[in-house]
């Protein structure tokens, strides 16, 4: 689903149509360029792999709360 | 080891039931969708169905709908596809698969279990 | 139903050789299409997902490409352990589909 439109900047195009386990992502990054037909988060997963989703579903600002919090907790 | 191990294959007469069973280890089972394919002899493979983490949405192909109905049950970490009204069509090597999400689309396959064998036959 | 033509059915070629698969979508199906290798009495397994990206483990030689109507898997040099057959697979939309295959045999 990310669409490489120039070096810089990646785009979604659609969205996954499932709500995916937490545990099983990584990392995300919010797509909000201009450039791009509509504002999207790319999820990465636990094997590196890219899913675009929808910002507006609330699993996805819920999986993004989730990371946050991962992120500012130090692992002991 | 990260396996699907499958088993509940046989022999059967049209018209007939079956149950196939399919195992999975190595990682959590609960948190992937989860697939049924098939392959006639010497044909090509067919997607049947699948099923979200907790069970709760399911796809069919039209060909076995009201026919094959596919469960899960992830305190056994196995999946299960219940065959009735079963047809000389229906003869096939059948395979559970780990189903993915994709970039422009959710359903590809990246774990596969070895296959049982279906033969709908008087 | 999406439906996925893949040609030539087979091919003959020899070790080392350049390999060119095609798979035709009826429709649009994006880059929602993933690649399989089958070797006879064996499950498939994934080569390429999102048309062009290599699965973990997969040999460098396998690589994807394409959009819209048109897929290619190319082997860039083939491997004795590269003849069998390939499978393309759309993942754009229900029912998920699969192509006739392609048999790659021995000259």
């Known amino acids: 689903q990310p669409d490489a439109i120039n070096a810089a900047v990646t785009c979604c195009y659609n969205f996954t149509n499932r709500k995916i386990s937490v545990q099983r992502l990584a990392s995300y990054r919010r797509i909000t360029s201009s450039k791009c037909p509509k504002e999207a988060v790319i999820f990465k997963t636990i094997v590196a792999k890219e899913i675009c989703a929808d910002p507006k579903q609330k699993w996805v600002q819920d999986s993004m709360d989730h990371l946050d919090k991962q992120t500012q907790t130090p692992k002991t | 080891e990260v396996q699907l191990v499958q088993s509940g294959g046989g022999l059967v007469q049209p018209g007939g039931s079956l149950r196939l069973s399919c195992a999975a280890s190595?990682?959590?089972?609960?948190?992937?969708?989860m697939s049924w394919v098939r392959q006639a002899p010497g044909k090509g493979l067919e997607w049947l169905a699948n099923?979200?983490?907790?069970?709760?949405?399911?796809y069919y192909v039209d060909s076995v709908k009201g026919r094959f109905t596919i469960s899960r049950d992830n305190a056994k970490n196995s999946l299960y596809l219940q065959m009735n009204s079963l047809r000389a069509e229906d003869t096939a090597v059948y395979f559970c698969?780990?189903?993915?999400?994709?970039?422009?689309?959710?359903?590809?396959?990246?774990?596969w279990g070895r296959g049982t064998l279906v033969t709908v036959s008087s | 139903a999406i439906q996925l033509t893949q040609s030539p059915s087979s091919l003959s070629a020899s070790v080392g050789d350049r390999v060119i698969l095609t798979c035709r979508a009826s429709q649009g199906v994006s880059s929602a299409l993933a690649w399989y290798q089958q070797k006879p009495g064996k499950a498939p397994k994934l080569l390429i997902y999102d048309a062009s990206s290599l699965e973990s483990g997969v040999p460098s030689r396998f690589s994807g490409s394409g959009s819209g109507p048109d897929f290619t898997l190319t082997i860039s040099s083939l491997q004795p352990e590269d003849f069998a057959t390939y499978f393309c697979?759309?993942?754009?939309?229900?029912?998920?589909?699969f192509g006739g295959g392609t048999k790659v045999e021995i000259k």
């Open positions: 099923i979200e983490q907790d069970g709760s949405e399911k």
């Open positions: 697979q759309q993942f754009n939309s229900y029912p998920l589909t």
């Open positions: 190595g990682f959590t089972f609960s948190h992937y969708w």
């Open positions: 698969a780990r189903d993915l999400e994709g970039l422009h689309g959710d359903g590809y396959f990246d774990l």
